[in-house]
């Protein structure tokens, strides 16, 4: 589920509309934002989700232990690999799911190595560090709301607020701050 | 000005409102999107702009030749440096301006080296390559429109469409695909 350290802070402008469960099926964005929301699929962290899930269903993913270990990319694999695999601070993508967010599923990058791959030996070196590169992404956050004006949350009723969250998009290899 | 290779493709949903020059001061977002637009300042490529411009005005920026060259990394300089300076695929931020976009100014990352810095020598090595990491950012694109229904653009009149553009957010060091 969602990593709370990556969550942004919501800022409301005016009073957002409070939708009932009937008005808004689970996992759907509010209609007045859907025209804009329809374009969310172009965002890389959203677009990657379907290919990650498809690969997972096809059984293409290696067993978890293999994909979470610091790898050595074989010389012959370098020729055809993607950036996240060819990087000496390699990363994998993990599908992050948050049911109170739209889009509910985002691809988060996770560094596979604590250090970086030494280009001479092909092995991980602690002389360098892999660090995540974060980017902001505008999302909608769903919150319980009151439909009767009482101020008490109406069961199954939600309002939406826009907010920025920090999404890890990849990893870069850095010289450590202290030795 | 804006690098066209990084521009997304607009997708309109319905007919957007056509604003006159009086209704909408130059560089401002449409009022119905401003509540949301007010939060754009939290996006990293937007937030960085003011600090980059402030540094430029204070004369903090080194002369262009120094900031666009691949640096020699010295261990003593690394202790207090930011990720983009400590990276062995270092980058700088450039303010990208596009008057037909909101936000008009965005910070784009530019790799400083074609290769990467060899941690042993502090100097560039061609055995590795610096590549940009791109991320999608939702922006508003301003286009001429007709206010009289004739279909011909009304001078000074604009409609806004949302679109995703690819923004370079940093650089990573990779094994070259082919020699």
């Amino acid at each position: 589920h969602h990593d709370p350290s990556l969550r942004g802070h919501p800022h409301s402008h005016g009073t957002p509309h409070c939708y009932s469960a009937e008005e808004l099926p689970l996992g759907q964005a509010p209609p007045h934002l859907l025209a804009r929301g329809a374009k969310w699929g172009q965002a890389l962290p959203v677009a990657l989700v379907s290919s990650l899930e498809a690969a997972s269903h096809r059984g293409r993913h290696e067993r978890p232990s293999a994909t979470t270990q610091c790898p050595v990319l074989r010389p012959e694999e370098v020729l055809e690999a993607d950036t996240h695999q060819r990087s000496i601070s390699p990363w994998r993508y993990r599908v992050d799911t948050d049911e109170d967010r739209y889009p509910q599923k985002l691809a988060f990058a996770e560094c596979l190595c604590r250090g970086c791959i030494d280009a001479r030996t092909g092995r991980e070196t602690a002389a360098l560090n892999s660090v995540r590169l974060l980017q902001s992404l505008l999302v909608l956050r769903r919150r319980p709301c009151s439909r009767d004006g009482s101020g008490l949350p109406t069961p199954g009723a939600f309002a939406f607020h826009t907010e920025f969250i920090h999404v890890p998009v990849g990893c870069t290899c850095v010289l450590p701050r202290s030795v | 000005h804006h690098d066209p290779s990084l521009r997304g493709h607009p997708h309109s949903h319905g007919t957007p409102h056509c604003y006159s020059a009086e209704e909408l001061p130059l560089g401002q977002a449409p009022p119905h999107l401003l509540a949301r637009g007010a939060k754009w300042g939290q996006a990293l490529p937007v937030a960085l702009v003011s600090s980059l411009e402030a540094a430029s005005h204070r004369g903090r920026h080194e002369r262009p030749s120094a900031t666009t060259q691949c640096p020699v990394l010295r261990p003593e300089e690394v202790l207090e440096a930011d990720t983009h300076q400590r990276s062995i695929s270092p980058w700088r931020y450039r303010v990208d301006t596009d008057e037909d976009r909101y936000p008009q100014k965005l910070a784009f990352a530019e790799c400083l080296c074609r290769g990467c810095i060899d941690a042993r020598t502090g100097r560039e090595t061609a055995a590795l390559n610096s590549v940009r990491l791109l991320q999608s950012l939702l922006v508003l694109r301003r286009r001429p429109c007709s206010r009289d229904g004739s279909g011909l653009p009304t001078p000074g009149a604009f409609a806004f469409h949302t679109e995703f553009i690819h923004v370079p957010v940093g650089c990573t060091c990779v094994l070259p695909r082919s020699v």
Partner: antibody, heavy 120, light 111 residues
Framework: QVQLVESGGGLVKPGGSLRLSCAAS????????ISWIRQAPGKGLEWVSY????????YYAESVKGRFTISRDNAKNSLYLQMNSLRAEDTAVYYC?????????????WGQGTLVTVSS | QSALTQPASVSGSPGQSITISCTGT?????????VSWYQQHPGKAPKLMIY???KRPSGVSNRFSGSKSGNTASLTISGLQAEDEADYYC???????????FGGGTKLTVL
């Protein structure tokens, strides 16, 4: 000093087998990918195979795949090439060479070579 | 047939400069400056002279230099000496089929 020394070459009949060895000294052998490269008499250099620093990964040129096997013993600082089903066209001087970047053809240390002759 | 094309032979007089070319494609030599060059005297093992297109290993004379233009890498030897007479090979990464490729070799004769 840094050196590689090959041994095990000789005359063998077509279809026969031979095992080449390469002894390393003067450097941390277990840190390096090593390749076998051959040179037919009067001809150019041809890359044959590599083995990763740990020995877990190997790769072969199409011309020797399925017939040759590369291996190493890091405890003994030694590299091996087991050659089976030898053909006349395998006749060459065989060199072991250290790779200075594991994924690039920068061979910075070479052995003196050992001659393999395949003839009936 | 080699994927990298070198002239079969070049010659020069002592003190002169000569250049040996190594022509590949946009996907090998043309992509990055990563060609390496080897010197081989008769009956001896090859010796690395240039790597990363233009870098010299320690112990190699600065009379040897490497460069690249388009899809062609070049080795230049200035102030030619008798001991430079040898075969010279360029090398590049190839494909999954032949991972590392060498040029056909160039015989340098010092007149």
């Amino acid at each position: 000093q840094v050196q590689l020394v090959e041994s095990g070459g000789g005359l063998v009949k077509p279809g026969g087998s031979l095992r080449l060895s390469c002894a390393a000294s003067g450097f941390t052998f277990s840190d390096h990918y090593i390749s076998w490269i051959r040179q037919a008499p009067g001809k150019g250099l041809e890359w044959v195979s590599y083995i990763s620093s740990s020995g877990s990964t190997t790769y072969y040129a199409e011309s020797v795949k399925g017939r040759f096997t590369i291996s190493r013993d890091n405890a003994k600082n030694s590299l091996y090439l087991q050659m089976n089903s030898l053909r006349a066209e395998d006749t060459a001087v065989y060199y072991c060479a250290r790779q200075s970047y594991y994924f690039l053809p920068y061979f910075d240390v070479w052995g003196q070579g050992t001659l393999v002759t395949v003839s009936s | 047939q080699s994927a990298l094309t070198q002239p079969a032979s070049v010659s020069g007089s002592p003190g002169q400069s000569i250049t040996i070319s190594c022509t590949g494609t946009s996907s090998d030599v043309g992509s990055y400056n990563l060609v390496s060059w080897y010197q081989q005297h008769p009956g001896k093992a090859p010796k690395l002279m240039i790597y990363e297109g233009s870098k010299r290993p320690s112990g190699v004379s600065n009379r040897f230099s490497g460069s690249k233009s388009g899809n062609t890498a070049s080795l230049t030897i200035s102030g030619l000496q008798a001991e430079d007479e040898a075969d010279y090979y360029c090398a590049s990464r190839g494909s999954r089929r032949v991972l590392y490729v060498f040029g056909g070799g160039t015989k340098l004769t010092v007149l």
